[in-house]
């Protein structure tokens, strides 16, 4: 996979203890019943593999057909493999479902690299390790694809959790989460804890390990430490947010904050890397290189292509800087910052050197479609997609990978003026010209 691919970087063994997690006391504002507390049945319901995505088990049809589905906050279609494919162990067989309804409509989704196309229908859908409900949802039955499914990834479909505006073929196709909230009493909120292993996992380890949690309808206190800080969802299409400042090891990049959000900034579990607009990427890499100048690395490493290896256990984490993104806060002129470690932005890669080595790819890359806060960012944090209140919350993840000297952080408040000016206003275009892929 290339460094720009829109699939998450990894899952696996996190730093938090597994098993039952008890809710803890909080002094945060009370919210309506059912929104907070312990969601034991949903904790640890995600699995996955390096660079290939976090997936949840879902059932489709009657009788239920079990499939693993990639969790993607950067798209809005529920789409599943519905025909034989060399990379699929199983697929949705519509003819075996008594509750399948054909919408007699096709859908075609081109990515920058690759595509999928299929036929639209509806069927009954549930999430075994989720809320105890069944909903009738739109399903795109993928009949043809190119460079979409990944060999060995163990998922057979994609759950687009973003808003209807970016659904294909158009915004009239109701996304799964909208259907779920409309048809049930599930609150209009979900939260994600993606747990990076910090080291590569082979296939059997992945299947046996935990990749994180998708809490549908609530917030589980055991999945984070400290406080949740919220940033407004600027516009309900992607999960768009506004970055107001960027620091490398505490040094401000000192760019016009519009550059950080050119042409948008989104939170996307379906992207591996932290992806930055060209100018921001160049400034950030220059700063990271300067901070880590005691060692030099090949040009291809900074392009996310070449791997750098160290003898097992000797990775010099301390020479790499922390990266802080300041996000617009909920209060006027107030921001907060999220800080990630090299343990998040250096991605462990498997099967390339000897067992005596730890090898990594640089997981920050250049974007022509704005900032994408992919798994590199999300693996540091518990992320709350509070659709009801049009906001996204960040707290330090209980499973993030760190060392004895530094930890990921969510801190605030900071005074930041004129934050509204940091948003970029995309000129209105014919929607048919939009590219789905974020390569």
């Amino acid at each position: 996979t290339q460094h720009g691919i829109r699939l998450p970087l990894r899952s696996g063994l996190g730093g938090a203890p597994l098993g039952l997690r008890l809710p803890r006391e909080t002094d945060e504002e009370p919210e309506e019943p059912g929104r907070r507390g312990s969601f034991v049945e949903m904790v640890d319901n995600l699995r996955g593999k390096s660079g290939q995505g976090y997936y949840v088990e879902m059932t489709v049809g009657s009788p239920p057909q079990t499939l693993n589905i990639l969790v993607d906050t950067g798209s809005s279609n529920f789409a599943v493999g519905a025909a034989p494919h060399p990379f699929l162990h199983r697929y949705y067989q519509r003819q075996l479902s008594s509750t399948y309804r054909d919408l007699r409509k096709g859908v075609y989704v081109p990515y920058t690299q690759g595509k999928w196309e299929g036929e639209l229908g509806t069927d009954l859908v549930s999430i075994p390790h989720g809320p105890n409900v069944t909903v009738r949802a739109n399903i795109a039955a993928i009949t043809e694809s190119d460079k979409f499914f990944i060999n060995g990834s163990n998922w057979e479909g994609i759950l687009g959790l973003a808003y209807a505006e970016i659904a294909r073929p158009d915004d009239s196709l109701e996304p799964f989460f909208d259907s779920l909230v409309k048809q049930t009493h599930v609150p209009n909120l979900f939260s994600l804890q993606l747990c990076g292993a910090g080291f590569p996992l082979n296939q059997s380890e992945v299947l046996a390990s935990v990749g994180g949690s998708m809490i549908i309808g609530g917030i589980d206190h055991s999945l984070y430490t400290g406080s949740l800080w919220y940033t407004p969802i600027r516009r309900e299409w992607y999960y768009e947010v506004i970055i107001v400042r960027v620091e490398i090891n505490g040094q401000d990049l000192k760019m016009d904050c519009k550059e950080y959000n050119y042409d948008k900034s989104i939170v996307d579990s379906g992207t591996t890397n932290l992806r930055l607009p060209k100018k921001v990427f160049e400034a950030a890499v220059k700063s990271i290189k300067a901070a880590s100048s005691t060692e030099k690395f090949p040009d291809g490493f900074w392009l996310g292509e070449q791997l750098v290896c160290w003898q097992a256990g000797t990775t010099p984490w301390n020479i790499f800087p922390v990266i802080s993104l300041y996000l617009m806060g909920e209060v006027t002129n107030q921001s907060f910052r999220i800080t990630i470690l090299p343990q998040q932005y250096l991605r462990p890669v498997e099967d390339v050197a000897t067992s005596q080595d730890d090898c990594y790819k640089f997981a920050i890359s250049q974007s022509s479609t704005g900032t994408v806060m992919g798994a590199v960012i999300m693996e540091g944090f518990y992320v709350v997609f509070d659709r009801a209140r049009k906001r996204i919350g960040f707290a330090v993840s209980a499973c993030h990978v760190h060392d004895e000297f530094r930890t990921a952080a969510v801190e605030g408040p900071f005074v930041t003026l004129d934050m509204e000016d940091c948003g970029y206003n995309i000129p209105q275009t014919d929607e048919s010209t939009l590219m789905t892929g974020r390569a």
């Epitope: 005691t294 030099k296 690395f297 090949p298 490493f301 070449q306």
Partner: antibody, heavy 120, light 108 residues
Framework: QLQLQESGPGLVKPSETLSLTCTVS??????????WGWIRQPPGKGLEWIGQ???????FYNPSLKSRVTISVDTSKNQFSLKLSSVTAADTAVYYC????????????WGRGTLVTVSS | EIVLTQSPATLSLSPGERATLSCRAS??????LAWFQQKPGQAPRLLIY???NRATGIPARFSGSGSGTDFTLTISSLEPEDFAVYYC??????????FGGGTKVEIK
């Protein structure tokens, strides 16, 4: 024009330490554009990377040799050195020093090599 | 560990003929591959880097191609001075420690 020249004893006894020096002439070892490396080639066999160093002293070693290898740099003398301890007959080889250029990725300039024989 | 396999081990050709040397990686190394030439009693010389770029001073009859796992060094018309051993090396995994076993191009 930049040149590399290896120097050191051609015969080392088993269990002793092999010591070689590479002198860089016609350019500065303190250039930020290069690493400096050692590669060896046993008689009639292929090439084996030993390790490399940046002028700041940052080193990378072949895991199979790491416990026995030390590479150091002396910027004042425009030299870098190789020490390989506890040698055996299997360490008999032509030892080359080389420059790692093209974005720190490729050995684009090599010394002529020096044969080191391990024998009592 | 990435293993580079060169074939054939020996290639017997006459001057003026075209030489095609293969280097296969056990897994993808993208385009991060070099080719070296080594004559008897001499140090290796960099011919090609990044799979297809000729190093400074290398004649145009040498060309490299390929990406991923399969790479080829082509000498369009062999000159007498081209008879030597050729090695490939991957630098996708860095530091660049993996060389192929070599292909000897000898006079037929």
């Amino acid at each position: 024009q930049l040149q590399l020249q290896e120097s050191g004893p051609g015969l080392v006894k088993p269990s002793e330490t092999l010591s070689l020096t590479c002198t860089v002439s016609g350019g500065s070892i303190s250039s930020s554009s290069y690493y400096w490396g050692w590669i060896r080639q046993p008689p009639g066999k292929g090439l084996e990377w030993i390790g490399q160093i940046y002028y700041s002293g940052s080193t990378f070693y072949n895991p199979s040799l790491k416990s026995r290898v030390t590479i150091s740099v002396d910027t004042s003398k425009n030299q870098f050195s190789l020490k390989l301890s506890s040698v055996t007959a299997a360490d008999t080889a032509v030892y080359y020093c080389a420059r790692l250029g093209h974005g720190y990725s490729y050995f684009d300039l090599w010394g002529r090599g020096t044969l080191v024989t391990v024998s009592s | 560990e990435i293993v580079l396999t060169q074939s054939p081990a020996t290639l017997s050709l006459s001057p003026g003929e075209r030489a095609t040397l293969s280097c296969r990686a056990s897994q993808s190394v993208s385009s991060y591959l070099a080719w070296f030439q080594q004559k008897p009693g001499q140090a290796p010389r960099l011919l090609i880097y990044d799979a297809s770029n000729r190093a400074t001073g290398i004649p145009a009859r040498f060309s490299g191609s390929g990406s991923g796992t399969d790479f080829t060094l082509t000498i369009s018309s062999l000159e007498p001075e081209d008879f030597a051993v050729y090695y490939c090396q991957q630098v996708y995994v860095w530091p660049p420690r993996t060389f192929g076993g070599g292909t000897k191009v000898e006079i037929k």
